[in-house]
């Protein structure tokens, strides 16, 4: 059997050792404990009896099914506990009882129905973190559960096989800042709404089928609910429990985001919001987001005029890899407040763009992220987009683009431009001159001839660039990241060239180190100021002694550097 | 209805690998989480696996998670249990199963196949 192996500052490591049992010789000097991945199964009331100032006990998948009752007494300066994933099939108010500093506790994946004939956590007034629940098992949350739990920073509830929740069961909790809660049906929802709408900052549902979720009022007073974040993860709606959801929100009036992630929609987007006063309460919604949606019948959406005016206050909306091929015309002058759209892996190409992008289309739009779609022209992207007045940010990278012309129209306040990965071989000045910001990362150029007056930051890494660019193109450049090139060389004059410059990044290049690079590299210490990734990523990868050496390290042969 | 056709189980040495197939018919595939679970000689069927519509997400027993994994093709309507360092005790007939609700609770499953024989010997 192998043994545990500790650091000086008594953090103890005792993963995959194949122990049987807690092992033996353990100290008042270890801080932290890490018992995973053993086949330990009994806990008995000495095995951690010397462990008095352990502050943090890792006891994951190590199949453990007993553990006496009194096996924690030793540990009150215990902060952070992880018994998930063993074969507890009960739990035992005991164990916790003399853990007054615990901070962090995971009991989650444990094959137990409740949390026990007592309430677990009475004593736990530290708490922040608290996991509990399992996929099979856990079917029952009681009113007793919680006591004595007045505020989480997190808590997650694993309750996807729940037959009974008691009524008021989360109530007690007065603060919870993240509530995550994995059902897998809807049964139990309005009631847990109703006990958390006072305390929880941000709500996450996980993997819940929401077909037939059916709305009724709340048994609730007039409450004002802190809610400002509600994510749905891995669940199922269709255009019915859609509508029903929406009328969740008139109880949660200072939602600011909401968030659909990975989740199925099984209908056509008919979505028909038949309350007004709905569109009034999503007024304080800033941020929607949506990623990976499948639509089993995306081909036949609807074109969602039905929700355009539920949408006109939204300031930021993200719709990710989720087969958008067009944002009708008429949806996109309904956007008035959008400032920040996100359009990645996609489907768009230049035809539906233009009409995306129509005459009035977001009129407030600043930043556009077209990131992995099927754009194919620059020249016709930019001319498209003439139309968005306010907008400042453009990220088109990761589409395959044509050899750029000479001339192209961009809006005319655009200051940042994202060309990664877009196949580029060679700049030009369809390349718009009023850049701040310019990323062309991850393409195929091997020089950069461009003048760009008002460029602050150029990403350049992952490219074929010889040389750093010549320093009269950036007269104000502040910022630059050539990694991965195949810079040689950069000397003092180029170095102070660059009068603005403040940060350079250019490791991993295939440095050359000459008598000069390596003397100017000794004689100026100050590069480790303007160099962020200095001295790990530069290395020597000529001559062939040097090969592998940091420029930092590595030594001029005197016969070399004094002929 | 879906119909669902396990393949893959037979005769394997403790410390082996087996990939457990089930096959489903229909074009709703998509649309349904899907389930492994097991029943021993003399013992209760017992849960394994789920993944959820698209396999965004998973979970597993703890007696099998770190050595088994579930994953699903919704183009070949199939989803799959590799199972690796296996132990005597996985030895039981695996069943697939199809439902409307990600959740380990056999009961909330409409769906099933009729099994498919894994011995784990010494």
């Known amino acids: 059997q192998e043994s545990l192996s500790c650091d000086a500052s008594g953090v103890c490591d005792g993963r995959s050792r194949s122990f049987t049992s807690i092992p033996s010789g353990l100290t008042a000097a270890m801080k932290s404990l890490d018992l995973s991945f053993n086949k330990i199964t009994y806990i008995g009331h000495g095995d951690l009896r010397a462990c008095a100032n352990l502050q943090v006990l890792i006891l994951k998948s190590s199949r453990i099914n007993t553990i006496e009752g009194d096996a924690f007494y030793s540990l009150g300066s215990l902060e952070h506990l992880d018994l998930s994933d063993n074969h507890l099939s009960s739990l035992s108010s005991s164990w916790f009882g003399p853990l007054s500093s615990l901070k962090y506790l995971n009991l989650m994946g444990n094959p137990y129905q409740t949390l026990g004939v007592t309430s677990l956590f009475p004593n736990l007034t530290n708490l922040q973190t608290l996991r509990i629940g399992n996929v099979e098992t856990f079917s029952e949350i009681r009113r007793i559960d919680f006591a004595g739990l007045t505020s989480l920073n997190e808590l997650e509830i694993k309750a996807l096989s729940l037959r009974n929740y008691q009524s008021q069961s989360l109530k007690s909790i007065r603060d919870i800042h993240h509530l995550t809660l994995h059902l897998s049906e809807s049964a139990f929802l309005l009631e847990i709404f109703a006990d958390i709408l006072s305390s929880v900052r941000y709500l996450e549902l996980r993997d819940t089928n929401l077909a037939r979720f059916q709305f009724s009022p709340l048994p609730v007073d007039e409450v004002s609910s802190p809610m400002k974040k509600l994510a749905f993860r891995g669940s199922v709606l269709t255009d019915e429990s859609f509508n029903e959801l929406l009328k969740l929100l008139r109880y949660i009036l200072e939602l600011s985001e909401v968030e659909f992630d990975d989740c199925t929609l099984n209908g056509l987007g008919d979505f028909n919001p038949s309350e007004s006063d709905v569109v009034s309460e999503l007024g304080k919604v800033e941020t929607v987001t949506i990623r990976r949606l499948h639509i089993p019948q995306f081909y036949l959406f609807y074109d969602l005029s039905t929700v355009y005016s539920l949408l006109e206050k939204v300031k930021r909306i993200t719709v990710e890899n989720s087969k958008v091929f067009l944002v009708p015309c008429s949806f996109s002058q309904h956007l008035k407040s959008l400032e920040f759209l996100d359009l990645s892996e996609n489907l768009m190409v230049e035809e539906y763009l233009k009409n995306s992008a129509c005459k009035g289309a977001w009129p407030s739009l600043q930043t556009l992220v077209l990131s992995q779609n099927h754009l194919r022209s620059m020249q016709k992207t930019g001319e498209i987009l003439l139309t968005l007045k306010n907008l400042t940010s453009l990220d088109i990278s990761r589409n395959t683009f044509h050899p750029m012309p000479d001339s192209c129209q961009w809006p005319e306040k655009m200051r940042f431009l994202n060309l990664s990965s877009t196949g580029i071989r060679v700049v030009k000045t369809c390349i718009p001159q009023t850049l701040e910001v310019l990323d062309v990362s991850n393409n195929n150029l091997d020089s950069f001839s461009l003048f760009l007056p008002r460029l602050q930051e150029l990403y350049i890494s992952r490219n074929k660039l010889k040389t750093l660019p010549d320093a009269s193109l950036f007269p104000v450049l502040l910022v630059m990241k050539i990694r991965e090139n195949a810079v040689s060389t950069f000397s003092k004059d180029q170095l102070g060239s660059f009068p603005k410059l403040e940060t350079l990044e250019a490791g991993d290049n295939h440095f050359v180190c000459s008598c000069e690079l390596l003397s100017f590299t000794m004689e100026t210490p100050a590069l480790a100021q303007i160099l962020v990734d200095w001295p790990d990523s530069y290395l020597c990868d000529s001559p062939p002694r040097l090969h592998g050496h940091r420029l930092q390290d590595a030594r001029p042969s005197v016969l070399e550097c004094h002929q | 209805e879906v119909q669902l056709v396990e393949s893959g189980g037979g005769l394997v040495q403790a410390g082996g690998s087996l990939r457990l197939s089930c096959a489903a018919s229909?074009?709703?595939?998509?649309?349904?989480?899907m389930s492994w679970f097991r029943q021993a000689p003399g013992k209760e069927r017992e849960f394994v696996a789920v993944i959820n519509w698209s396999g965004g997400s998973t979970d597993y027993s703890t007696s099998v998670k770190g050595r088994f994994t579930i994953f699903r093709d919704n183009a070949k309507n199939t989803v799959y249990l590799e199972t690796t360092s296996l132990e005597l005790e996985d030895t039981a007939v695996y069943y697939c199963?199809?439902?409307?609700?990600?959740?380990?609770?056999?009961?909330?499953?409409?769906?099933w196949g009729q099994g498919t024989p894994v011995t784990v010997s010494s």
């Open positions: 229909g074009r709703t595939f998509s649309r349904y989480v």
């Open positions: 199963a199809a439902g409307e609700y990600y959740t380990g609770a056999s009961s909330r499953y409409d769906h």
